[in-house]
């Protein structure tokens, strides 16, 4: 089943992918499509790296971390309702069948207020404000708003920095991460 | 090929306002996370700001925020750095820099324009 | 907030092999990129993401990154390698991107 995540109409939605690479420098090619992931590649793709760098991007859908060290999250800017549904990361290890595929489940809400023409950090609702965890037993849900005050921008480096954490293990749960190698 | 373009540096006075342009031209504008970096007079570099390729985010460094608002027009290819409340200590040279493809926050800056000198003295 | 730390200066004879590092907590965990300014220029990128060398760049210019430390390697130093490298990453904790202070290279 799919991890929920959630954002608000004109925010920016964040989807999260990690994977370990074997040795620095040494990437796995990676796509994200829209749809659920098929058997092969991905469908719809919006965003694509290889063993280098990004080599394929379509607008709004932006990589957010630092892919080079394994972080291949997705930022979608300023979604629309029509941005909601499954999404796939796939880590294309290589090897037959060997590929990981991790299908993410974007919810797009109406945004509660007309937000004000600011164009500044609208990363505030990038990150789920609900997320449903796994990997500890019984699904839990856990509100952001009862973690420490930080910046939401941080959760995806806080998952690389602090793996050993509980916060870090159920973000890595929660979205998709694989260790290579 | 790449080329930016700086413009609009000059002499202000303390607590005066400049605005900066950087005209971009060789590449898809709104493809790329564009940033502004300065460097005092026999000073380090320093980042200054950074606009996502939408322009839908914008991040500041913690010396400027409040005072600097980093801008782009996709349609004429074209950054913005709107700099009020100018002090003695933001005297440099301003470079404005690409980010890399895809990223949403650049990563590194991948080509620079040459400068644009900013002196704040009475 | 992170810091990155560099030598002010770095001596070497031509021919030889310069090391300029780039000092900061964990850094391995970082993508380090490297620029070299030469005086009244701008900054050039010569290694991004710890080692890839863009295109242009002499084979000369080679980088690593692991611990608490990334290393910029020059080896058959040149006469025209002499200028100021600057280290960079971008803190994700405070969405900066941050340089170190810049190494002088010097060409005896």
């Known amino acids: 089943s799919e991890v929920e995540y959630r954002a608000e109409v004109g925010q920016n939605a964040y989807l999260p992918c990690f994977y370990t690479p074997a040795a620095p420098g040494n990437l796995v090619p990676v796509c994200w499509g829209k749809g659920a992931c098929p058997v092969f590649e991905c469908g719809n793709v919006v965003l694509r790296t290889d063993e280098r760098d990004v080599n394929y991007w379509t607008s709004r859908y932006w990589l957010n971390g630092d892919f080079r060290k394994g972080d291949v999250s997705l930022t979608i800017e300023n979604v629309t309702l029509a941005d909601s549904g499954i999404y796939c990361c796939r880590i294309q290890i290589p090897g037959i069948m060997n590929d990981e595929k991790f299908n993410l489940k974007l919810v797009i809400k109406p945004a509660k207020v007309t937000p004000a023409p600011t164009r500044q950090r609208d990363f505030t609702a990038a990150f789920p404000r609900m997320l449903t965890t796994r990997g500890h037993g019984p699904a839990e849900t856990q509100t952001l708003g009862s973690l420490p005050d930080i910046n939401l921008t941080q959760i995806s480096t806080l998952a690389n920095e602090l793996r050993d954490s509980r916060l870090a293990n159920d973000l890595r749960d929660s979205g998709a991460t694989i260790r290579i190698g | 090929e790449v080329q930016l373009l700086e413009s609009g540096g000059g002499l202000v006075q303390p607590g005066g306002s400049l605005r900066l342009s950087c005209a971009a031209s060789g590449f898809t504008f709104s493809s790329y996370a564009m940033s502004w970096v300065r460097q005092a007079p026999g000073k380090c570099l320093e980042w200054v700001s950074a606009i996502s390729g939408s322009g839908g985010s914008t991040y500041y460094a913690d010396s400027v925020k409040g005072r600097f608002t980093i801008s782009r027009d996709n349609s004429k290819n074209t950054l913005y750095l709107q700099m009020n409340s100018l002090r003695a200590e933001d005297t440099a040279v301003y470079y404005c820099a690409r980010g890399s493809y895809g990223t949403y926050y650049g990563n590194y800056f991948e080509y620079w324009g040459q400068g644009t000198l900013v002196t704040v003295s009475s | 907030s992170y810091v990155l730390t560099q030598p002010p200066s770095v001596s070497v004879a031509p021919g030889k092999t310069a090391r300029i590092t780039c000092g900061g907590d964990?850094?391995?965990?970082?993508?380090v990129h490297w620029y070299q300014q030469k005086p009244g220029q701008a900054p050039v990128l010569v290694i991004y993401?710890?080692?890839d060398r863009p295109s242009g760049i002499p084979e000369r210019f080679s980088g690593s990154n692991s611990g608490n430390t990334a290393t910029l390697t020059i080896s058959r130093v040149e006469a025209g390698d002499e200028a100021d490298y600057y280290c960079q990453v971008l803190d994700r904790r405070s969405d900066h991107f941050l340089f170190g202070c810049g190494t002088k290279l010097t060409v005896l």
């Open positions: 964990n850094i391995g965990g970082k993508s």
């Open positions: 993401y710890d080692s």
